[in-house]
């Protein structure tokens, strides 16, 4: 039978660490992390790490009992937790019968937004006390709310992650940029900044209707290639809503004209 893994939480040092071992298995060959979305209940889910590792293909895996994975997160609150994955069988060959290295994966460790994680893994039995313990570590920074997986988190949807403003911005002339975007049903107030190294233009927008809106913004210097930053102020996130960006291009001859005054905003900073 092929070995599989059974994983469970292990806080503190592994019991094998207290025992002297004449021989120990080698280190891992590779360690990788990706995100997975797992359903918890209807319309509820959590984002977890899918941690996969590859064993070194040599006879030392005959001694391998388990692999221990620890994750520490550095954000507002530091976190640290470990799981121990026991191999259900002794390894009878250094590679899978079908070819390729022995590869295993564990899905767990809930992921917070925009957090730096250090994931480290080592084989058990590991090196004896006062000896170098071979372990493999990878850094992983979890993405923010605009990530295709993260954007469905409640924290993100409340900050406007599912809103697609579809920003277009074009330079009408040396002094004017036209910005078009789709408003958000959760709010009616926006700020628009046009920036290069400094702020070239600024506008505040109030718009109650759910619609495509257009704003003409005066600029102080060359605006082509500048970044347009659109910040919504929604009921659910107040001043902490997700900012969206676009780039100023030259207006084409066929670009839509600025709509009549009732839909047009030209509020200089």
């Amino acid at each position: 039978r092929e070995p599989t893994i059974q994983c469970g939480s292990e806080t503190g040092p592994s019991p094998e660490w207290m025992v002297q071992h004449t021989l120990t298995p080698g280190d891992l060959r590779d360690l990788q992390v990706e995100l997975v979305k797992t359903s918890v209940a209807a319309e509820e889910f959590s984002i977890l790490m899918n941690i996969s590792w590859i064993l070194r293909a040599d006879a030392s895996i005959r001694l391998l009992k388990a692999t221990k994975i620890c994750v520490s997160g550095k954000n507002n609150m530091n976190s640290y937790s470990c799981v121990r994955c026991n191999y259900t069988e002794a390894f009878q060959s250094q590679t899978r019968p079908s070819g390729g290295k022995w590869t295993f994966s564990y899905v767990g460790f809930p992921v917070e937004l925009s957090t730096l994680y250090l994931i480290s893994a080592h084989n058990i039995p590991n090196a004896n006390m006062n000896e170098d313990s071979p372990s493999l570590s990878v850094n992983f920074t979890s993405p923010g709310c605009l990530n295709h997986v993260m954007k469905y988190k409640k924290q993100c949807t409340e900050a406007g992650s599912l809103w697609d403003p579809d920003i277009t911005a074009c330079k009408k002339n040396e002094k004017m940029v036209e910005v078009n975007f789709t408003t958000n049903p959760l709010g009616n107030r926006y700020t628009i900044l046009i920036q290069r190294d400094t702020t070239l233009g600024f506008s505040r927008v109030l718009e109650n209707k759910l619609m495509r809106t257009s704003v003409a913004i005066p600029v102080t210097e060359e605006s082509e290639g500048a970044v347009v930053q659109l910040t919504p102020y929604l009921h659910t996130c107040g001043n902490d809503c997700i900012r969206r960006e676009g780039t100023v291009v030259l207006c084409s001859e066929t670009s839509a004209p600025i709509p009549p005054d009732d839909n047009r905003r030209m509020l200089g900073g």
Epitope: L23, A57, D58, A59, S60, S93, Q94, T95, G100
Partner: antibody, heavy 118, light 107 residues
């Protein structure tokens, strides 16, 4: 049955390179590492040069040969290759390909290629 | 690298006798040891792996033993086809190394 076929001999000039082949049959090529072994002459000992995993082409060399041998595989034809570079008279030897078993005991051997540098 | 020291380097014996070849590793190889037989002008052939397991087709007069750093190959009632060279090899972790060989010749 498992077979590893190697050409009998190669004659090469000093400073030149040679690429030795090891054509396999009778087993799933990607399931076992392929090793290369040098035997310096009659009654002389065996030296492990390195190994390659045909599945993903991972290679491990004996440090002594890392600037001398280049291991490759061609999965489509189930063949392993070893290129020997900057040849000198010291490289004159019989070179064997040998397939690993479950671990790295060498369960099957090719007939060997005699390389003569002259 | 792990050194494999094989002894004796050569042995002259008669058909029907029993011989033992020994192999010492410079460190514990956890029983990851193989033995090979090589006849003149031929490629080596696997005899024994994992210290005691006989390869397919190997006669039962061959047997292996040992652990840690000390290993041996015993051939009971030598036959004429058993003459040739014998090598031990560890496969604990790369780089793999062979013993210097034992040349078994007919007395």
């Amino acid at each position: 049955q498992v077979q590893l076929q190697q050409p009998g001999a190669e004659l090469v000039r000093p400073g030149a390179s040679v690429k030795l082949s090891c054509k396999t049959s009778g087993y799933t090529f990607i399931s076992y590492w392929m090793n290369w072994v040098k035997q310096g002459g009659p009654e002389q000992g065996l030296e492990w040069i390195g190994r390659i995993d045909p599945y993903d082409s991972e290679i491990q060399y004996n440090q002594k040969f890392k600037d001398k041998a280049i291991l490759t595989v061609d999965k489509s034809s189930s063949a392993a290759y070893m290129q020997l570079i900057s040849l000198t008279s010291e490289d004159s030897a019989v070179y064997y390909c040998a397939r690993s078993g479950g671990f790295d005991w060498f369960a099957y051997w090719g007939q060997g290629t005699l390389v003569t540098v002259s | 690298d792990i050194q494999m020291t094989q002894s004796p380097a050569s042995l002259s014996v008669s058909v029907g006798e029993t011989v033992t070849i020994t192999c010492r590793a410079s460190e514990n190889i956890n029983s990851n040891l193989a033995w090979y037989q090589q006849k003149k002008g031929k490629s080596p052939q696997l005899l024994v792996y994992d210290v005691t397991n006989l390869a397919d087709g190997v006669p039962s007069r061959f047997s292996g033993s040992g652990s840690g750093t000390q290993y041996s190959l015993k051939i009971n009632s030598l036959q004429s086809e058993d003459f040739g060279s014998y090598y031990c090899q560890h496969f604990w972790r790369p780089p793999y190394t062979f013993g210097g060989g034992t040349n078994l010749e007919i007395k």
